[in-house]
Interface confidence: low
């Protein structure tokens, strides 16, 4: 009968030929009376057999990722008679894996949005790399993820590729971060190959800034002839937040005379000082009022950032008009 062990050939061998093993008949007494032949796909081009000994060699570099096994047929013939000594037999040569493929991130580019001031541990995104090497062959396709860029704000779970927040971030200081993730195969052991991907993480705004007046004192004038409802000037606060988190409402905090009102222009986010009652230069030629500004929308959990509203003082001078 036929005698052989399982045949394996490592992929990507740089040698000109590689001895795989021996295929022989147990009737072969080693006197060179038998001739061995190799048939099938790859015979003669990829594999050869020593006609006398049955030793099999790979004569070209193999790529497991291209082809992982070869099915060949062997014959053994008695040279003297030309007859088959054994029935033709089929056998398999398996291409064994080496770590010749780096992990690749197939879904890039990655982008994620996370609210600013999110607590540590908040999940941002999961990145996944794939490795073309054999997952059943050692650790060639077992990946570990690590952070090359993004500390101290982000961390990555080594085995899952889940990116989490590791330090609170303030959108008003920096509104986006580029995180670079490396996937290393061989679970990070020597000989590991790596691939990298970049993740753009954008911070969405939360209402963590209150509006603050640009000036601590505004000086306005109003003619004593001005009718009620007249706009006598504008005041302005700034808010480092954006969108609806920067929408604000102005109001009078202090006006003993109850002569003025403030309305909010929601297009420009300005406060418009309005004359509520007519003024008389001869009766009172100047006024002092205090205005305050608050955000329009403040969720309960963010009230800590809005404890004391910003205020400003407005001095209003009444202009005299000649009266008949």
């Amino acid at each position: 009968g036929w005698v052989w062990n399982q045949f394996f050939v490592p992929e990507e061998m740089n040698t000109t030929s590689h001895h795989i093993g021996q295929l022989r008949s147990d009737l072969d007494n080693g006197n060179n009376s038998f001739q061995y032949k190799l048939l099938g796909a790859g015979a003669g081009s990829t594999f050869i057999i020593d006609e006398r000994t049955g030793d099999i060699y790979a004569i070209q570099k193999l790529d497991r990722e291209e082809r992982s096994l070869y099915i060949l047929r062997a014959q053994v013939i008695d040279i003297a008679t030309g007859r088959a000594v054994e029935p033709e037999s089929e056998f398999v040569i398996k291409v064994s894996d080496i770590n010749d493929n780096e992990p690749k991130f197939l879904d890039e580019p990655y982008e994620a949005i996370v609210p600013e001031m999110s607590p540590e541990g908040t999940l941002v995104i999961q990145v996944t790399a794939s490795d073309a090497d054999d997952p059943s062959s050692g650790n060639n396709a077992r990946l570990l993820y690590s952070l090359l860029q993004g500390q101290p704000y982000f961390s990555v779970e080594p085995t899952t590729g889940v990116i989490r927040i590791s330090s609170k971030m303030d959108r008003e200081l920096q509104d986006e971060y580029w995180v670079i993730i490396q996937a290393k195969d061989m679970i990070g052991q020597p000989g590991a190959l790596s691939g990298t991907t970049s993740v753009l993480i954008k911070l969405s705004d939360v209402n963590d800034n209150k509006p603050i007046f640009k000036e601590s004192l505004y000086r306005l004038t109003v003619s004593e002839s001005a009718p009620t409802g007249t706009s006598i000037g504008t005041i302005m606060a700034y808010d480092n937040d954006i969108g609806e988190n920067a929408e604000m409402d102005y109001s009078i905090e202090e006006d003993d005379s109850q002569t003025f009102d403030i309305i909010t222009n929601h297009e420009t986010q300005e406060g418009i000082v309005i004359l509520k009652k007519k003024v008389d230069f001869e009766h009172q030629n100047h006024y002092g009022i205090r205005a305050k500004v608050k955000n329009h929308h403040v969720p309960e959990q963010l009230m800590k950032y809005h404890t004391e509203a910003s205020t400003t003082f407005i001095k209003i001078q009444v202009e005299d008009v000649d009266e008949p």
């Epitope: 890039e108 580019p109 580029w178 490396q182 790596s194 990298t196 970049s198």
Partner: antibody, heavy 121, light 107 residues
Framework: EVQLLESGGGLVQPGGSLRLSCAAS????????MNWVRQAPGKGLEWVST????????YYADSVKGRFTISSDNSKSTLYLQMNSLRAEDTAVYHC??????????????WGQGTTVTVSS | EIVMTQSPVTLSLSLGERATLSCRAS??????LAWFQQKPGQAPRLLIY???TRATGIPARVSGSGSGTEFTLTISSLQSEDFAVYYC?????????FGGGTKVEIK
Amino acid sequence: EVQLLESGGGLVQPGGSLRLSCAASGFTFSSYAMNWVRQAPGKGLEWVSTISGGGANTYYADSVKGRFTISSDNSKSTLYLQMNSLRAEDTAVYHCAKGGMGGYYYGMDVWGQGTTVTVSS
Amino acid sequence: EIVMTQSPVTLSLSLGERATLSCRASQSISSNLAWFQQKPGQAPRLLIYGAFTRATGIPARVSGSGSGTEFTLTISSLQSEDFAVYYCQQYNYWPLTFGGGTKVEIK
């Protein structure tokens, strides 16, 4: 501080040979890929060859394949470029450049000042 | 071979102006692109890698963007030290290839 110092350039006749060296310091030489890049007079940059940190993998531009050989000696922290069958079009300043983190993935982060190779009869 | 095409060849600008340099790859190279600056008689200097990440010591006025085949290097406000030749380089595929360069000169 990372430093790369090329040497070995000079005047050579067409068909001749030269061996360029690049002495590296300030980093773990064996952990990084190394590159040779050249620049012909008044021209742009042209990649020539790369060797991986362990020296297992080598890559060449088609214009030098079969004529140039890149190698490294980790014990000496030195990169080499053996140039054979030199041609007039090989005349250039040859720079060695250190690979970045992760081998080849971050480009060439530090460059040497270069050594001049002139091929002329 | 990936062909890298830079435009314009020359950019004439004044101090303080914004410089926008383009680089196009003949096929997608993901974000595996680097930008280098070179001054006469000096070695190239890495500015940007990974298409958008600034190298150590590169000022914030220098930024990179793009992915796939179209990339841009922007210098928001040109300083005297920014007048030089700029090269893009792809390292996604072998062989590594450089663009032909863009010279940024004083107007």
